[in-house]
Interface confidence: low
């Protein structure tokens, strides 16, 4: 039952008329080359649209900006360019929206050739703006303190770090020669500085500084730094080891007061580390292979970010463009999807349901045939197109999509065979977090989730003008079409409020006549399609991760199972903006699968038991932890971070303080004398990349 209506799909009565009454066109009298949108606040209905037209002339850029504001989810817009004094706004900095529902907005003006700059700030969701002169030219977008939106941090084009405590009115310079700065927890600022030069040279000689009082005092928390990053509770730094060009990853969970070496494989000069994902429990770390292979190994950490277990070999991660397909499936706990580069250089998709414990191929969709890449026409897998395919300019308009409040739903472009195909992909959907898949739409599409999964909307990816939108109220089983305009438009994007709680979708594009083109948006409100609020009878109980209902431990992942209340596919009703995912957790008995291998141990292929690393047999397991030599008494297991199991298997584990001093605090790395039997990784060369969700920045 893919694409259009099959024999068991009956269309919703009067849908066209209901949608026609809720379709709002807005034509922008604007010829600008680009448009950027920003939702201001959650559930406010406020959208700012910034259009930009710019022409580079010699060393400067001349341009024009227009600002539009909507208060009704994009159904109508008002030209409010006068609020920013018709100033040219730097589109590369975008619209900086304040955290939570602060209503704060910052627009950075382009004041070419000036020693300072100008920002326009709003505290009332963009209703009014005031302008503030800056005593510096920003190098990148100004960032808000996540916990106090009045406090702003900026890095200048002269690598000065500036701070404002009054939402941009007054600024003070905190530090010179700052290469990178980030907000930490509770108003802490971390930054790297070069005390004897510039940021482009001597990158391995940076100091990592911390201030907890907005720059009144500073503490150097680490030296010989190449780069640093924050993810969950973890602070990571790549540090020159004192052995020439080698670098090592160090980790702190106390904001840099104490550090430990990450027990990762050593890496050579041309390799890199990357944090693929991190939360307060654990980290996914990619370690690049030697040579220009385009792949590496994923390791998963313990709860301290110190001990790592091998999770996935031959993980695709190109060094050229820094592309990886690693995707957190946010609609189901513990699920991640990524790509591997197989021996024959084909790319295959792998999925884990247990936070990297085991990886498998995606099950073949029941309604699909194996394509030409399959050796056996009866046995093949689904392979998902993500960042790498998009970077290779394949016909893939969107990366995989999942939303935390649309439980179990994953939508992605893919092909069915032995590997990713370069042929035109189709769109597939999973309603159980990636265990099973169905072809949803033929050919490439743009797609979005509305009303917490109550509606899925799609538009065909085409080079021709379009005027038809497709929608489904049953998680992609049956589709209806709606012609939203008589005059087709050149489609540029689908826009819906982040969080998938809205019932409005905006279709952006432009119309072209003989001499001119102009921006146009169509906003469609689906509230009359979902006429009533969902009631209890509209929901059904669903056990997540269920693969064998006969097994008492069915659904146990990371030590517990969860039952969810999910909307029945047959129910056509509104979850509503206030919808909260209702779940019932149950603790499971512990098994060996609830433990990762401890320091000095590893899991042989297809075995749940941890065995001692051959090179460590007969050695005391001693390692340096928080500046003390520790002796580890273990039978090889450590509880997986975030695992909640109780009872059952309970391997013994004890760490004894050997009362010997050692150093893993690398303020003076040359003095290290730790017996670190896990060969802490040094890395050099290209890029150590740290991030908390999708790759945030490259070294």
């Amino acid at each position: 039952r893919s694409t259009e209506q099959g024999e068991s799909c009956s269309g919703l009565l009067g849908a066209d008329a209901k949608l026609a009454g809720n379709t709002h066109q807005h034509i922008f009298n604007d010829l600008s080359g680009s448009v950027s949108l920003a939702w201001v606040g959650d559930g406010t209905g406020v959208i700012l649209a910034l259009t930009t037209f710019q022409v580079p002339i010699f060393m400067i850029t001349i341009g024009q900006s227009k600002l539009y504001r909507s208060e009704d989810y994009g159904k109508s817009f008002e030209d409010v360019t006068n609020l920013i004094n018709n100033t040219f706004i730097r589109s590369d900095f975008g619209i900086a929206i304040g955290p939570e529902n602060s209503g704060k907005v910052i627009l950075t003006a382009d004041v070419s050739g000036s020693h300072g700059s100008r920002i326009f700030v709003s505290s009332d969701f963009g209703k009014s703006f005031t302008h503030q002169e800056l005593p510096f030219v920003p190098l990148m977008q100004i960032t808000y303190n996540p916990e106090n939106s009045n406090v702003l941090l900026a890095l200048s084009n002269k690598n000065e770090l500036w701070l404002s405590e009054d939402f941009g009115t007054n600024w003070k310079k905190l530090y010179d020669t700052v290469c990178l700065a980030k907000w930490g927890r509770k108003g802490t600022i971390f930054f790297t500085a070069n005390h004897n030069g510039s940021c482009s040279n001597d990158r391995g000689m940076l100091e990592l500084e911390r201030t907890t009082d907005y720059g009144k005092s500073f503490k150097t928390v680490a030296s010989k730094i190449y780069s640093f990053g924050l993810g969950g509770k973890f602070l990571f730094a790549s540090v020159m080891t004192g052995k020439g060009t080698l670098r090592a990853i160090h980790v702190s969970v106390d904001d840099g007061d104490t550090w430990n070496m990450a027990q990762l494989p050593s890496v050579g000069q041309e390799q890199f580390y990357s944090i693929l994902a991190a939360n307060d429990d654990m980290v996914f770390m990619h370690v690049d292979e030697p040579g220009d292979t385009g792949f590496g190994t994923i390791f998963t950490s313990d709860d301290r970010g110190i001990v790592y277990s091998k999770s996935l070999d031959r993980h695709l991660y190109t060094t050229t463009g820094g592309e990886t397909d690693f995707t957190n499936v946010t609609s189901l706990r513990g699920v991640y999807i990524t790509s591997v580069l197989s021996e024959d250089n084909s790319i295959q998709t792998m999925i884990t349901f247990d936070q990297g414990g085991r990886w498998t191929h995606l099950r073949k969709p029941e309604n699909s045939e194996c394509d030409a890449t399959a050796k056996n026409k009866n046995e093949c897998s689904l392979h998902i197109h993500a960042s790498y395919s998009i970077s290779q300019k394949l016909n893939v308009p969107m990366a995989p999509l999942s939303e935390p409040n649309a439980v179990g739903i994953v939508i992605a472009h893919g092909s069915v065979g032995d590997a990713i195909s370069v042929m035109v992909p189709d769109v597939y959907i999973s309603d159980d977090g990636g265990y099973s898949w169905t072809k949803m739409l033929e050919g490439p599409h743009y797609y979005t989730i509305l009303d917490s999964g109550g509606i899925i909307v799609a538009i065909e990816h085409s080079s021709r003008p379009i005027n038809v939108i497709k929608f489904s109220t049953d998680e992609g089983q049956c589709w209806q079409t709606y012609t939203f305009t008589r005059d087709p438009i050149y489609f540029t994007g689908l826009a819906s409020e982040p969080g998938a709680r809205s019932m409005n979708i905006s279709i952006w594009g432009f119309t072209e006549s003989f001499l001119t083109s102009q921006w146009v948006s169509y906003t469609i409100d689906f509230k009359d399609i979902l006429e009533r609020n969902c009631e209890e009878k509209d929901y059904t109980i669903w056990l997540a991760h269920s693969t064998d209902p006969e097994d008492y431990e069915d659904g146990c992942i990371l030590g517990y199972k969860e039952q969810f209340l999910r909307l029945r596919k047959s129910s056509v009703c509104q979850n509503g903006r206030d919808y909260v995912v209702t779940k019932q957790p149950s603790i499971c008995l512990c098994s060996l699968e609830d433990f990762l291998c401890d320091f000095g141990y590893y899991r042989p292929e297809n075995d749940s038991k941890c065995v001692e690393q051959p090179e460590l047999k007969g050695h005391d397991l001693e390692f340096c932890l928080y500046g003390r030599e520790e002796h580890l008494t273990t039978n090889g297991y450590r509880k997986i971070p975030g695992d909640k199991c109780q009872g059952g298997v309970n391997p013994v584990r004890e760490v004894k303080d050997l009362k010997k001093k050692c150093t893993s605090n690398f303020l003076s790395p040359e003095k290290q004398n730790s017996k670190s039997n896990g060969s802490a990784g040094g890395s050099g060369g290209l890029n150590d990349i740290f991030e908390a969700q999708k790759i945030e920045w490259h070294e």
Epitope: Y552, G576, Y579, V580, T582, Q584
Partner: antibody, heavy 117, light 108 residues
Framework: EVQLLESGGGLVQPGGSLRLSCEAS????????MSWVRQAPGKGLEWVST????????NYTDSVKGRFTISRDNSKNTLYLQMNSLRAEDTAVYYC???WGSGFDYWGQGTLVTVSS | EIVLTQSPATLSLSPGERATLSCRAS??????LAWYQQKPGQAPRLLIY???NRATGIPARFSGSGSGTDFTLTISSLEPEDFAVYYC??????????FGPGTKVDIK
Amino acid sequence: EVQLLESGGGLVQPGGSLRLSCEASGFTFRSYVMSWVRQAPGKGLEWVSTISGGGGNTNYTDSVKGRFTISRDNSKNTLYLQMNSLRAEDTAVYYCAKNWGSGFDYWGQGTLVTVSS
Amino acid sequence: EIVLTQSPATLSLSPGERATLSCRASQSVSSYLAWYQQKPGQAPRLLIYDASNRATGIPARFSGSGSGTDFTLTISSLEPEDFAVYYCQQRSNWLIFTFGPGTKVDIK
């Protein structure tokens, strides 16, 4: 540490109304199903009502349907039970409880509701 | 409506003895059954949920078994603090619960 603190109990005449509150702390309140359970003096436990995490789904034991309303304010981490048209047989200690699996893993200390003329 | 029956109504035993409490449902409740202990003047305490899972902090002498309609709570060796009233409770539907009448375990 998970804590549930009920309040609002007291003496009320038959036909009267009371509103019980339960203030929760120590866990992500909005993510959990919450319930009210009562116990008449010297008697066993009786489930009264349950509400889903977002507040959109509720259920009641037959004897209180149409008279009692369960609700929650996730911004205040508070569960409520509005009791109207109270009867003598509603006299009981009312417990607020957090759901876990098939049961209730944390309970408040209870608040006594006495319906008497 | 699903009705739970507990037997015996009272169980008189000595410390150190094994206690076996029974709970029967009028129709299948799968494994959605919980057991509680209640002492005078106190709120109930969850012992077992989903028929056989011990709740946090509950000693190993308490165990639950059964599925469908017949369930058992076993206390392998009674401690003095175990003398109390024990209730079973089922969840037949997502948001519908019922309790059994209780079994009193007292000192012989």
